[in-house]
């Protein structure tokens, strides 16, 4: 009886996984065995496929085969047995074209409030993907074990973090990766889950600023408790992106090891031009909070972008205010050459209550003010390029009387 | 598969220093920050200290500060604990784990431990 | 220095037995917590991570739980192989330090 050959051959390559499967085109023949050839462009003689020689399952794994995986394959099966059915060709493909990207590999870390998330290529030093590794995205899917409902965040890199959860919370949640530029998306990671921890008796510093004076940087923050020590770290912002790269590490600003203030001042040759994260913990001697949010800080932009300088007329029922040139130290105005808006805010000196007015002009009229009443002004400049979306700090306060009635001339 | 190699046994002089390898393999050796840790016959485990292999930052307990030294060779992925003036309180298996990802945001644990080299301080 | 205190230093134990282990840590370590199983001449292995993350390979009668300060390590039906001694790990805070051990032994 002629062996018929086989038919239904799926290749399917996922990373450097190659997987070849196939139906038996007669399953009443027993001990049949299948062989793969192989054939590159531009050749004309095939080759056996090695991992794909006299295989008596329907699947076999030809990943152990050098490959140029941009360059087009063709493949040929037949069956086996005293004699040999005809060869059954599967139609060309190009490895890369036909590739997913594996699941990644995921490393979870829990706060009370946030978990970091790291994720890496689930297979190391991939051939498939040696020329796109940095350029993975990733996006995940997150749900609280409890609920089920879930919420995808899509476009983060090798570390990301999600803030605003619940302390002694299950959270569970699946990554998977993309390439963008070959509009390839990628297969889940399995689920991972794990747990929030207790909330922590020591919340993590907040507002995290930097300002410059003079040759230095001034880091600022807000925090809870009095007494404590604070640690700051930096990282290079493009290494979030870069896997396993081992720069990526959060290194100490020696300046800013164990300092009992919620600031710390530290040269500006600390840092090369570039742009850097930065974070805050503080500790109390026996327990320690969590890293603060991560600010975004460019050396280029907080260099140039110094707060406002502004002088004030008064009048009974507003304030005029003329927003000049920020001073360098030596008291030498900055030019700055890019377009600023300003932010003015101001408050009765009595009251929280703040008020805010957005400006283009560097002339600015505070109107409704009540006479005789003492009002207080700070001002932060805005670049208004959307790539560089850059805040100078806010200046130092000013507080000045308007003037009594019927003197607004 | 992740593998530490570490020698059996060595014998040394009081007064007399000693340096002892670990020999990483199976992971990306500059990666993960690499323990050491001190057991004493029939006593409980302490930690020495840890050794980031990528750039030699070394986090110490402060017990072990003037005893232990610890380096790395990241062309072999060799960690080192070099021990100084032994005496017999320095008898021991010392033991090199790895521990968490130097990239992580918090210390992780100790997952792949050597067999231990069990040091005797004896005349 | 943050202590950690295994309260019982040896169990007297039968086959087939459910076996919790406490250690009890001096300050809260956010569950940075490890518990490892040493046997004599050998290297500890590392049983659980994180308070409760079973490691790979390791028998399901093995669980973690706890949070704070106070954490337990379960067996569920004690084998022979399980016959050995057990350390909590804590590593929130350096120096990461041990708890003192307990030691299973069969009656």
């Known amino acids: 009886k002629n062996l018929k050959s086989p038919q239904k051959v799926e290749v399917d390559i996922i990373d450097d996984n190659f997987i070849l499967r196939w139906n038996r085109s007669d399953e009443s023949v027993g001990n049949v065995t299948f062989s793969f050839d192989y054939q590159k462009t531009g050749m004309d003689n095939w080759i056996k496929l090695s991992g794909c020689q006299n295989i008596t399952s329907t699947k076999c794994n030809f990943s152990s085969l050098k490959l140029n995986v941009y360059e087009e394959i063709k493949l040929r099966i037949r069956a086996e047995k005293e004699n040999t059915s005809s060869w059954y060709e599967v139609d060309s493909f190009t490895p890369f074209r036909k590739a997913q990207i594996g699941p990644p590999e995921v490393h979870l870390e829990a706060e009370d409030k946030a978990i970091v998330i790291h994720i890496s290529p689930g297979t190391k030093d991939s051939v498939m993907w040696a020329l796109d590794g940095l350029s993975f995205t990733y996006s995940l899917v997150i749900w609280k074990n409890s609920s089920g409902v879930e919420e995808r965040i899509e476009n983060i890199y090798s570390r990301h973090k999600i803030y605003k959860l619940s302390p002694e919370t299950t959270y569970c949640l699946k990554v998977k990766a993309a390439l963008l530029t070959s509009w390839k998306i990628g297969v889940y990671s399995p689920v991972h889950c794990i747990k929030t921890t207790v909330e922590n008796e020591l919340p993590p510093p907040e507002n995290i600023e930097v300002s410059v004076q003079n040759q230095n940087y001034v880091l600022k923050w807000d925090y809870t408790y009095a007494n404590m020590t604070f640690q700051v770290q930096w990282l290079h912002a493009f290494l979030k992106r870069n896997p396993g790269n081992h720069l990526y590490k959060w290194k100490q600003i020696p300046d800013c090891e164990n300092v009992k203030t919620t600031q710390c001042v530290f040269p500006q040759n600390v840092f090369q031009k570039g742009i850097y994260l930065l974070r805050v913990q503080a500790s109390d001697g026996n327990n320690t909070s969590f890293w603060s949010e991560e600010i975004k800080f460019d050396t280029e932009i907080q260099a140039f972008l110094l707060p406002p300088v502004f002088n004030i007329r008064s009048l009974s029922d507003s304030f005029h205010i003329y927003i000049g040139a920020p001073k360098q130290s030596g008291n030498t105005p900055v030019i700055q050459d890019y377009p600023l808006i300003y932010e003015i805010i101001f408050w009765e000196n009595t009251s929280n209550a703040e008020r805010k007015i957005i400006e283009k002009k560097t002339d600015v009229t505070v109107p409704n003010l009540k006479p005789l009443t003492v009002y207080c002004v700070k001002a932060r400049a805005h670049t208004m390029d959307e790539k560089l979306n850059k805040s100078s700090v806010f200046s130092d306060a000013v507080c000045e009387k308007t003037k009594p009635g019927n003197t607004s001339k | 598969q992740v593998q530490l190699q570490q020698p059996g046994t060595e014998l040394v002089k009081p007064g007399s220093p000693v340096k002892l390898s670990c020999k990483a393999s199976g992971y990306t050796f500059t990666s993960f920050w690499l323990n050491w840790v001190q057991q004493r016959p029939g006593r409980g485990l302490e930690w020495i200290g840890k050794i980031d292999p990528s750039d030699s930052e070394i986090r110490y307990n402060q017990k072990f500060k003037d005893k232990a030294t610890l380096t790395v060779d990241k062309s072999s992925n060799t960690a080192y604990i070099q021990l100084s003036s032994l005496t017999s309180e320095d008898s021991a298996v010392y033991y090199c784990?790895?521990?968490?990802?130097?990239?992580?945001?918090?210390?992780?644990?100790?997952?792949?431990w050597g067999q231990g080299t069990s040091v005797t301080v004896s005349s | 220095d943050i202590q950690m205190t295994q309260s019982s230093s040896s169990f007297s134990v039968s086959l087939g037995d459910r076996l919790t282990i406490t250690c009890k840590a001096s300050e809260v370590i956010y569950n940075r917590l490890a518990w490892f199983q040493q046997k004599p001449g050998n290297a500890p292995r590392l049983l659980i991570s994180?308070?409760?993350s079973l490691e790979t390979g390791v028998p399901s009668r093995f669980s973690g739980s706890g949070s704070r300060k106070d954490y337990t390590l379960s067996i569920s039906s004690l084998q022979t192989e399980d016959v050995a001694t057990y350390y909590c790990q804590q590593y929130w805070s350096s120096p990461f330090t041990f708890g003192s051990g307990t030691k299973l032994e069969i009656k």
């Open positions: 994180g308070a409760t």
């Open positions: 784990a790895r521990g968490g990802g130097i990239y992580y945001d918090y210390d992780g644990a100790m997952d792949y």
